[in-house]
């Protein structure tokens, strides 16, 4: 039972407090736990932040830092979807020039298929 | 393969100081939070520091002003400067990858999850 | 502070037994708990973080269950190997903190 609904951070939450805001959410919904010095609070969030991806678990769903090499947006630990500056997408990974046999694509910075 | 090995623990007189280090290899250190955790001789956890990354220090209340934790990212060592020791401190001194205060991973980098062998401290006269 | 309380310092098992060690954080920590092994003579080793997910390497007779404030992890069959400490820890707010371990014996 969320308590505190009228709170906009117990937005989605199935449980929540005036402190440390969300502690679960609802089921479609992704935990993200919000750290400022040594506080915490929780939210439950449609679509992970930048740099996190979206982990589904039995338990709770939650956000998940992307770890994927000069990856700044992810769709699973292991598919990158947005590169950092300088960094080009080739099937969900970033490399610093395009594979052989693939073209930069400059305004996305994606690979293509093709002559350079 | 992560490897942590710690050095310069021993005995020391109480009101005295130590300062011990983790060497750590295989991995990336400098991109990641590093912590200190030691376990009492009645074989209890308590967690005694963490260095962000970025070197943002985090330490519980029972040795915030006495201990010190530090990071050389490019000899890839990790310090504790411990001063105004107790005869509480005696303990296996860990330390260990992960366990950042000032950052949310939603991994396994929120936990701490390799250790060294550890480093022996005993404070006693 | 969260007291992360593990209400059994020894169990007693056999090998090939089911045996399910316990956890109460003193409030909700959202899941953020992990368990660790800690073989005689050895350091601490990650078993499980964020409640459910099995660190690498790590075989899955373990599991954990549990969310809120209290939290169970299961060795489904237990080999003589598994002869250890086990601590539970909360990674949701500092202090971090653990529970005081829980000592699996093999018959």
């Known amino acids: 039972r969320a308590s505190y609904v009228s709170n906009p951070i117990c937005k989605g939450c199935l449980s929540c407090s005036k402190d440390n805001g969300c502690s679960r959410c609802q089921q479609k919904l992704f935990f993200f736990l919000r750290r400022e010095g040594m506080r915490q609070y929780g939210e439950c969030l449609h679509s992970c932040p930048s740099g996190y991806y979206g982990h589904r678990a039995p338990d709770m769903n939650r956000c998940a830092r992307c770890r994927i090499e000069n990856c700044d947006s992810c769709f699973s630990k292991d598919f990158c979807t947005k590169c950092k500056v300088g960094f080009y997408l080739h099937r969900g990974r970033c490399f610093d020039e395009c594979p052989d046999g693939f073209a930069p694509l400059e305004e996305t910075m994606e690979c293509v298929e093709g002559c350079e | 393969e992560v490897k942590l090995v710690e050095s310069g623990g021993g005995l020391v007189k109480p009101g005295g100081s130590l300062k011990f280090s983790c060497a750590a290899s295989?991995?990336?250190?400098?991109?990641?939070?590093m912590s200190w955790v030691r376990q009492t001789p009645e074989k209890r956890l308590e967690w005694v520091a963490s260095?962000?990354?970025?070197?943002?220090?985090y330490y519980p209340d029972s040795v915030k002003g006495r201990f010190t934790i530090s990071r050389d990212n490019v000899r890839n060592i990790l310090y504790l400067q411990m001063s105004s020791l107790r005869s509480e401190d005696t303990a296996m001194y860990f330390c260990?990858?992960?366990?950042?205060?000032?950052?949310?991973?939603?991994?396994?980098?929120?936990?701490?999850?390799?250790w060294g062998q550890g480093t022996s401290v005993t404070v006693s006269s | 502070d969260i007291v992360m309380t593990q209400s059994h310092k020894f169990m007693s098992t056999s090998v090939g037994d089911r045996v399910s060690i316990t956890c109460k954080a003193s409030?909700?920590?959202?899941?953020?708990v992990a368990w660790y092994q800690q073989k005689p003579g050895q350091s601490p080793k990650l078993l499980i973080y964020?409640?459910?997910t099995r660190h690498t390497g790590v075989p899955d007779r373990f599991t954990n269950s549990g969310s809120g404030t209290d939290y169970t992890l299961t060795i489904s069959s237990v080999q003589a190997e598994d002869l250890a400490l086990y601590y539970c820890?909360?990674?949701?707010?500092?202090?971090?903190?653990f529970g005081g371990g829980t000592k699996l014996e093999i018959k």
């Open positions: 409030q909700d920590v959202s899941s953020a």
């Open positions: 964020w409640a459910s």
């Open positions: 820890q909360q990674h949701y707010s500092t202090p971090w903190t």
């Open positions: 260990a990858r992960g366990g950042d205060p000032g950052v949310y991973n939603g991994d396994y980098e929120d936990a701490m999850d390799y």
């Open positions: 295989g991995f990336s250190f400098s991109s990641y939070a």
């Open positions: 260095i962000s990354s970025g070197g943002s220090t």
